[in-house]
């Protein structure tokens, strides 16, 4: 058993049929010695008396808010949560496996630049009685500070018969140098509590590996005289690290017809303009990627080809 | 320490070209190592990230763009002095700071070159003959060093009398390649910045 936060404790259980469970001793936080009784949740049934209560925690029925009283007055609470371990593996029931970029990916993180700010998100089908707490650091043995905000519900989607909820959190490394060469990864730890179930999820990454620039901005077309060619121009996104001559991007320009089956014309360039051929009903799209370190491409910025 | 915004410098172009070749070569070599050594811990997640130039050179600090010198997190108190001549400079007006930056890059390349050559000698003794360093990568390191053209004492190649542990050597190769790729990215960024300045 360990303390998650004040008056909230996590009991780690090996979860299998007829498992013996864990013996837990609760102590009432009071100077009083006599006349103390214990109850669980809203029940008035007295579970025991005395300053300490010893319980055998085997299942969720044994978890919950234990309260010690004296003469009708509440003295203190202890909330017990369960953390299940099945076949030596901690349960991951609360969050959905996003399977990207690999299986058992519960947390996904992205950074728009090298400033040390990043966003992580996760998915769940659970809509109520759910809380998250996020901590982060650079490295684990001698951790350096990363400050994370509160996790918030950022999107709701309908997937078949289920609703899916996306939560996200923003974090900022306390003293980040955009030009630094990372040797210690960022660690992100998410504590998830659903009703009386506790789970924790972690992710470890270098900012350089989770870079995904915003799409290029101010995408414009200039038709060339007596030609169905156009000069496409764009600018670096505002959120990208500066100076741009140091943090350079490379770009992919795509001409895509109306139907997905149509051949796509693609041009790769380090410049912020390109000449492409417009096709009927086509759109021109441009996306960006760090020129020197191949992390993710940005989403496409698009304009109709007319 | 920072790179001042200097006048356009025609001597920078060869260095930019060589640094781009360097990044391509080390990225290809790392990819080859990951594929060939698929049963060894050779991915970014599996290896320890070591920097053989740590406390010997200070390329990131010495080559910091002017715009980032206002960022206190980027300023490191380490002081390093370097030799200040080099053909990528091409102009007498080129500042001491830029010379410091380029000579730091040169020292990085020299250190990695020695490590890679030593390692290749060991890998050539491996009866499995599983992996060797790409000669193209070694040649590209050499070309960039020549373009930088700093006078420096040659570092003797390390020789070892004991029987090499090939497993450890291959893991060390992965560690070195990952670190060198990161440094090659920094070098490319620096050359691009100097070229645009």
């Amino acid at each position: 058993i360990w303390e998650l936060k004040k008056d909230v404790y996590v009991v780690e259980l090996d979860w299998y049929p007829d498992a013996p469970g864990e013996m837990v001793v609760l102590t009432c936080d009071t100077p009083e010695e006599d006349g103390i009784t214990w109850t669980l949740d809203q029940s008035s049934e007295v579970l025991g008396s005395g300053k300490t209560l010893t319980i055998q925690v085997k299942e969720f029925g044994d978890a919950g808010q234990y309260t010690c009283h004296k003469g009708g007055e509440v003295l203190s609470h202890s909330l017990l949560l369960l953390h299940k371990k099945e076949d030596g593996i901690w349960s991951t029931d609360i969050l959905k496996d996003q399977k990207e970029p690999k299986n058992k990916t519960f947390l996904r993180c992205e950074a728009k630049n090298y400033s040390g700010r990043f966003t992580c998100w996760w998915l769940t089908t659970i809509s109520t009685d759910l809380t998250f707490s996020v901590k982060s650091s650079r490295g684990s043995s001698d951790p350096q500070g990363v400050t994370c905000g509160a996790a918030t519900l950022s999107a709701e989607r309908v997937r078949g018969d289920n609703k899916e909820y996306e939560y996200s959190v923003e974090c900022q490394e306390d003293s980040a140098c955009p030009a630094a060469e990372e040797s210690l990864p960022i660690e992100v730890m998410v504590d998830a509590v659903h009703k009386l179930k506790y789970e924790n999820y972690t992710s470890s990454f270098f900012i350089r590996d989770i870079i995904k620039p915003d799409p290029p901005k101010n995408l414009q077309l200039k038709p060339l005289k007596n030609s169905r060619q156009v000069e496409v121009s764009w600018e670096y996104p505002d959120t990208w690290s500066t100076p741009h001559s140091y943090f350079s991007l490379t770009f992919c320009v795509q001409v895509q017809g109306k139907s997905k089956r149509e051949k796509k014309d693609r041009v790769f360039t380090d410049k912020t303009s390109a000449t492409v051929i417009c096709r009927k009903n086509a759109s021109i799209s441009v996306r960006a990627q760090d020129r020197y370190y191949s992390s993710s491409w940005s989403e496409w910025a698009s304009v109709p080809c007319s | 320490r920072n790179l001042p915004v200097a006048t356009p410098d025609p001597g920078m172009f060869p260095c930019l070209h060589h640094s781009q070749n360097l990044l391509r070569a080390v990225s290809n070599m790392l990819q080859k190592a990951r594929q060939t050594l698929e049963f060894y811990p050779c991915t970014s997640e599996e290896i320890d990230h070591e920097d053989i130039t740590k406390d010997k050179t200070s390329t990131v600090e010495a080559c910091l763009p002017l715009e980032l010198t206002k960022n206190e997190s980027c300023l490191n108190s380490r002081e390093t002095s370097f030799i200040t001549n080099g053909s990528c400079l091409a102009s007498r007006k080129t500042s001491f700071m830029m010379a410091l930056c380029l000579s730091s890059i040169y020292e990085d390349l020299k250190m990695y070159q020695v490590e890679f050559k030593t390692m290749n000698a060991k890998l050539l003794m491996d009866p499995k003959r599983q992996i060797f360093l790409d000669q193209n990568m070694l040649a590209v390191i050499d070309e960039l060093m020549q373009a930088l053209n700093f006078n420096s004492e040659t570092v003797p190649q390390k020789s070892s009398l004991e029987e090499p542990d090939f497993y450890k050597t291959k893991i060390k190769l992965c560690i070195l390649l990952h670190a060198f790729r990161i440094r090659a990215v920094t070098i490319d960024r620096v050359m691009s910045y100097l070229n645009a300045s």
């Epitope: 007596n226 169905r228 051929i277 417009c278 009927k280 009903n281 | -």
Partner: antibody, heavy 119, light 110 residues
């Protein structure tokens, strides 16, 4: 910039025929080329086109009856099995724009070549 | 697509104005992929107007084009004897296979 059609002659029905349009002064890799025909005393009929990238398109009535192909300086129109209805002057015409859409304006035109199908 | 040209033939007097209409059974690509041609006997057609209203190089300014979508007009103001010819419209569409000429309008100058 000039175009000239050749290969027009008298043929018997069912005898395959290939017409050739020879171009000069521009590149077929940047222009779309069209074939148009005109039966005696009648209007213009668009047959089909081959675009700068080698893609072809045909009028719905012409599909399966005609095939358009090109080399670096010529554009061919193959008539698989001519009938008397195919008697006409055949013109080749270039798309006016560089990298023109199919259906863009046609300019310049060749002088035409006459095909007579008769038994 | 079917392009219907009206009227045909049309008679004009020197110095007068002639209007030829071209109606498309479907909307041309981007509302303006329509061109006009002049053809004289024994000659290939000659481009007059493209993109519905843009005058081709070397074409006298008495020729003008207008319209959008499915309805287009070629106007010859200040008709000259040399304008006696047959005029065709050509439409381009979303589907390339729908590309077609109108039936033609013969202009007789008296």
């Amino acid at each position: 910039q000039s175009l000239e059609e050749s290969g027009g002659r008298l043929v018997t029905p069912g005898t395959p025929l290939t017409l050739t349009c020879t171009v000069s002064g521009f590149s077929l890799s940047t222009y779309t080329m069209n074939w148009v025909r005109q039966s005696p005393g009648k209007g213009l009929e668009w047959i089909g086109a081959i675009s700068y990238d080698g893609g072809t398109a045909y009028a719905n009535w012409a599909k399966g009856r005609f095939t358009i192909s090109k080399t670096s300086t010529t554009v061919d129109l193959q008539i698989a099995s001519p009938t008397t209805e195919d008697t006409a002057t055949y013109f080749c015409a270039r798309g006016f724009y560089v990298y023109a859409y199919i259906g863009d304006a046609f300019d310049p035109w060749g002088p035409g070549t006459l095909v007579t199908v008769s038994s | 697509a079917v392009l219907t040209q009206t009227p045909s033939p049309v008679s004009a007097t020197v110095g007068g104005t002639v209007t030829i209409k071209c109606q498309s059974s479907q909307t041309v690509y981007k509302n303006n992929l329509l061109s006009w041609y002049q053809q004289k006997p024994g000659q290939p057609p000659k481009l007059l107007i493209y993109l519905a209203s843009t005058l081709a190089s070397g074409v006298p300014s008495r020729f003008s084009g207008s319209g959008s979508g499915t309805q287009f007009t070629l106007t010859i103001s200040g008709v000259q004897c040399d304008d006696a010819a047959t005029y065709y419209c050509l439409g381009g569409y979303d589907d390339d296979a729908d590309t077609a000429f109108g039936g033609g309008t013969e202009v007789v100058v008296v």
